[in-house]
């Protein structure tokens, strides 16, 4: 498995992982105690046929070409968690590992 | 986690799982000995904001709205393997569990 990494200067048009810092403070999400911001990353770009396809299934659906199938799109194929400290609905402070908060790899699926 | 299930008669426009039988014989993929066909399913439909979002990350990227982020798309969020019997490149018969061949659930990511 591999995926492309890009930045704001890249001319890559294909599916790629781009850096993105999520700033909870800027969103006004003040129930999040820590971190106030973190590197989340995001996926963007075109999915030409077969390029960076995560699953054989994607190729098979392309072959079968059913009505309404839009073709693969650039989406996270590997994600990782971050540890967070936040208030829950009962105003208790919670420390927990929140899954799928960081995009590690992008692909076409 | 849940996802919508549709069929060819559905009027649902949102992200949904549709039935699809993949026929290896029709593709001419004769290196696959068995199965000759299987129920693969596929994802299709629109991803309105927050509908069927698999990850909090999807919501955060929408909030941050970076250049080039296309918004979530309807993609498999749960997949399962099938057992297959096939010839490898060395013309040996292989029995194996092939991952991510069946879409069990669709969502927006």
């Amino acid at each position: 498995d591999f995926g492309l990494d890009c930045d704001e200067h890249s001319t890559e048009s294909r599916c790629c992982r781009y850096p993105l810092t999520v700033d909870f403070e800027a969103f006004g999400w003040d129930w999040i105690i820590a971190p106030k911001r973190y590197k989340a990353n995001y996926c963007s770009g075109e999915c030409e046929f077969v390029f960076l396809q995560k699953y054989p299934h994607t190729h098979l659906v392309h072959q079968a070409n059913p009505r309404g199938s839009a073709g693969p799109c650039c989406t996270p194929t590997k994600m990782s968690p971050i540890n967070m400290l936040y208030f829950n609905g009962k105003e208790q402070i919670i420390y927990g590992k929140i899954p799928a908060m960081v995009v590690d790899r992008c692909g076409c699926s | 986690d849940f996802g919508l299930d549709c069929d060819e008669h559905s009027t649902e426009s949102r992200c949904c799982r549709y039935p699809l039988t993949v026929d290896f014989e029709a593709f001419g993929w004769d290196w696959i000995i068995a199965p000759k066909r299987y129920k693969a399913n596929y994802c299709s439909g629109e991803c309105e904001f927050v509908f069927l979002q698999k990850y909090p990350h999807t919501h955060l990227v929408h909030q941050a709205n970076p250049r080039g982020s296309a918004g979530p798309c309807c993609t498999p969020t749960k997949m399962s393997p099938i057992n297959m019997l096939y010839f490898n490149g060395k013309e040996q018969i292989i029995y194996g569990k092939i991952p991510a061949m069946v879409v069990d659930r669709c969502g927006c990511s």
């Epitope: - | 290896f24 014989e25 001419g28 000995i33 019997l85 010839f87 029995y95």
Partner: antibody, heavy 124, light 107 residues
Framework: QVQLVQSGAEVKKPGASVKVSCKAS????????MHWVRQAPGQGLEWMGN????????NYNQRFKARVTMTTDTSTSTAYMELRSLRSDDTAVYYC?????????????????WGQGTLVTVSS | DIQMTQSPSSLSASVGDRVTITCKAS??????LSWFQQKPGKAPKSLIY???RLVDGVPSKFSGSGSGTDYTLTISSLQPEDFATYYC?????????FGQGTKLEIK
Amino acid sequence: QVQLVQSGAEVKKPGASVKVSCKASGYSFTGYFMHWVRQAPGQGLEWMGNIYPYNGVSNYNQRFKARVTMTTDTSTSTAYMELRSLRSDDTAVYYCARRYYYGTGFADWYFDVWGQGTLVTVSS
Amino acid sequence: DIQMTQSPSSLSASVGDRVTITCKASQDINSYLSWFQQKPGKAPKSLIYRANRLVDGVPSKFSGSGSGTDYTLTISSLQPEDFATYYCLQSDEFPLTFGQGTKLEIK
């Protein structure tokens, strides 16, 4: 419908060779193993071997390995079984049969269709 | 090679009878056993596969059972068209081997 049609009866002299054909129709010929089975007059069935037409991979019964060759012509969807150095005890009806997989395990199959048989008589 | 011993080698029965044919393998064949019917001058016809599964289109009066090394074919109510020779086949390993056959005759 799926059908296997074999070539006509043959009379051969000892030491000669015979090539029996089996023409398939009604399915994708290249994607199914073809087996050959023979039956001597008044006797039981004996497996000779098989071939996968897509790539020509074959597997022979050790008893016949030195004398048998199985081939296919995918352009005409025909399987062939050639037996060399014929002896009188090779007199038999030769059948082709298609192997159909109902599952994905190595042995998850059965013979779903048979050819009508070809009588080969070896006599001086 | 796996030896398949079929018994009896011949059997006389009447229309309406229930008959059982057995097949014994020289080693465990993991239920990879098929049964065939053959009529004079005709190709064999598959009846049962994987020891107990009925081939599509075969009447339910035919049934198979067994596991390990011992297997049986049962015909619940014999009809005139059922008088034929029956063979078992093991497909657990190569070479494939058949039983020697059971000739079912009208009494």
